[in-house]
Interface confidence: low
């Protein structure tokens, strides 16, 4: 008699999670009499997937009616595949007996499950950096299969090249994770910039997943300071203005010092936003020139976003004409009592 063969024609089958898989198996002879069973894995730890004689296998059906006479097709259909179903499936012929005896196994069909990557999560640096410095962004995505995956980085639509990517684990696994770190050099114009991590995978059908991070979370643009004075209508008053330009983020503390002594402190409130996302602010003092016949130095000191203070000083200029307008008895504070503590505009 011709020796019975168990034929599993496909070496491998690939299915997307949620879909159904068909695993083909035919035998070349009806003899000897005995059942066919399907297993996942080989050896003592193998898992019974389908047994026609007994058991409840709600997700597994036979392609043809296995009870029909002369049937030699024992292919099965597994519905609602999950990544946990991945593995090698064996169609096994048993000889009828008490108990049944394993006679011959097919060569096995490897079922690989295509699983979509999770949405990429992009995380940036924990501390802000200033323009010209390099910051790192990390992108992570998990749970995909097969292992082949493409990850790209973009900054404002332009592809980046300075990044390093790892896919884990290195060996064979049911699913994989990807982690990539990109290095970005900051510029003063990056407040409105965005980095994008784009992941392409066979399961996404050409529609990649994207994760984003705003450089506004990573950048600190330090301010530039300018201090100048302007005369006022009242001949014994001048306006001393501190112009704070092009800073980000908004957090700013300004202190006026008179000859090194603190005269007032204020936090930035009404800011002007520039097109590039940075801010401008100005603070001013009304100075009574009659109180300062001798030279006085006014200093505008700015502490931006918790960083060490920067300052700009201005020597008060009092003209001979202004000095003539002051009676000998005039004295008073640097800040005119009628002026607000600090102006912004």
């Amino acid at each position: 008699e011709e020796e019975l063969q168990v034929i599993q024609p496909e070496k491998s089958v690939s299915v997307t999670a949620g879909e159904s898989a068909t695993l083909n198996c035919t035998v070349t002879s009806l003899i000897p009499v005995g059942p066919i069973q399907w297993f996942r894995g080989a050896g003592p730890g193998r898992e019974l997937i389908y047994n026609l004689k007994e058991g409840h296998f709600p997700r597994v059906t036979t392609v043809l009616d296995p009870t029909k006479r002369n049937n030699m097709d024992f292919s099965i259909h597994i519905s609602n595949i999950t990544p946990a179903d991945a593995g090698t499936y064996y169609c096994v012929k048993f000889r009828k007996g008490s108990p049944d005896v394993e006679l011959k196994s097919g060569a096995g069909t490897e079922l690989s499950v295509r699983a979509k990557p999770s949405a990429p999560v992009v995380s940036g640096p924990t501390a802000r950096a200033t323009p010209e410095h390099t910051v790192s962004f990390t992108c992570e995505s998990h749970g995909f299969s097969p292992r082949d995956i493409t990850l790209k980085w973009f900054k404002n639509g332009n592809e980046l090249s300075d990044f390093q990517t790892n896919v884990d684990p290195a060996g064979k696994s049911v699913s994989y994770s990807i982690r990539s770190t990109a290095r970005v050099v900051l510029t003063r114009r990056d407040v409105h910039s965005q980095v994008i991590c784009e992941v392409a995978h066979v399961t996404l059908q050409g529609d990649p997943l994207r994760g984003t991070a705003n450089l506004s979370e990573a950048i600190r643009v330090p301010p530039t300071l300018e201090v100048f004075q302007r005369p006022m209508r009242a001949e014994n008053q001048v306006n001393v203005t501190c112009q704070v330009r092009k800073f980000y983020p908004q957090r700013l503390l300004l202190t006026w010092l008179e000859n090194g002594n603190v005269s007032q402190t204020e936090t930035a409130s009404t800011l002007t936003e520039n097109k590039d996302g940075t801010y401008n602010w100005r603070s001013w003092l009304l100075v009574n020139t009659c109180a300062h016949r001798d030279g006085v130095v006014l200093t505008c000191q700015v502490e931006h976003d918790g960083q060490p203070a920067v300052s700009k000083s201005h020597a008060l200029e009092v003209s001979a004409h202004q000095k003539e307008q002051c009676s000998d008895t005039t004295s008073g504070p640097v800040l005119a009592p009628t002026a607000p503590l600090g102006g912004s505009g």
């Epitope: 999670a17 949620g18 999950t82 990544p83 946990a84 991945a86 499950v113 699983a115 979509k116 999770s118 949405a119 999560v121 992570e140 998990h142 749970g143 299969s145 790892n166 884990d168 684990p169 290195a170 696994s173 049911v174 699913s175 982690r179 997943l209």
Partner: antibody
């Protein structure tokens, strides 16, 4: 049956480094994430971080600068180090196994150690 | 970070009666692969936490079938069909979608 056992000093002085080890018995370190979770007295659970069998680490950003998790495959152990401890780090520290083999990410922290109490005090 | 909010804070129960705990996340835990990345844990008094439910609705090995998890996206519920005395303790939900993994504040279940 996999079992986890934490070990390390029960008392650590402020500003010093806390070091704990978790020994895995009855199973392999392969194909799992190995996690540290803590619970301050009378409070809820806080995930500190975990390490995969290939040495890849993930940390809680709130602790990242102070925490290091490492793996010793030969000893079937993983460890936690936390620098510059304060009284706020007083807690029960648990080591735990996180399943990740199903191919869909993390699907349950299924084995926990019994926890070890660490007090930070001078 | 994803913020997990549980309610109620405390739940007095009668043995044999049903009980229900709610957990809400600050962002969706449902991903394109149709899994909800939410676990439920029970911490009995003086013990370590134990896994009850994973991926939203899957009962862990050895967990009685009176426990069930449901919900999707941002709203999840743990139900105990008939509370038993051994079910007392603090129940925590945890999101496993992304690191840092975050827990809810806990719900203390006690017998009336």
């Amino acid at each position: 049956q996999v079992q986890l056992q934490e070990s390390g000093p029960g008392l650590v002085r402020p500003s010093e480094t806390l070091s704990l080890t978790c020994t895995v018995s009855g199973g392999s370190i392969r194909n799992y994430y190995w996690s540290w979770i803590r619970q301050p007295p009378g409070k809820g659970l806080e995930w500190m971080g975990f390490i995969y069998d290939n040495g890849r680490t993930f940390y809680n950003p709130s602790l990242k600068s102070r925490v290091t998790i490492s793996l010793d495959m030969s000893m079937n152990q993983f460890s936690l180090k936390m620098t510059s401890v304060t009284a706020a780090d007083t807690a029960v520290y648990y080591c735990a196994r996180v399943r990740a083999y199903s191919g869909i990410g993390l699907d349950g922290t299924d084995v926990w150690g019994q926890g070890t109490t660490v007090t930070v005090s001078s | 970070d994803i913020v997990m909010t549980q309610s109620p804070l405390s739940l007095p129960v009668t043995p044999g009666e049903p009980a229900s705990i709610s957990c809400k996340s600050s962002q969706s835990l449902l991903y394109s692969n149709a899994y909800n990345y939410l676990d439920w844990y029970l911490q009995r008094p003086g013990q370590s936490p134990q896994l009850l439910i994973y991926l939203g609705s899957n009962r862990a090995s050895g967990v009685p079938d009176r426990f069930s998890g449901s919900g999707s996206g941002t709203d999840f519920t743990l139900k105990i069909s008939r509370v038993e005395a051994e079910d007392v303790g603090v129940y925590y939900c945890m999101q496993a979608l992304q690191t840092p993994l975050t827990f809810g504040g806990g719900t203390k279940v006690e017998i009336k």
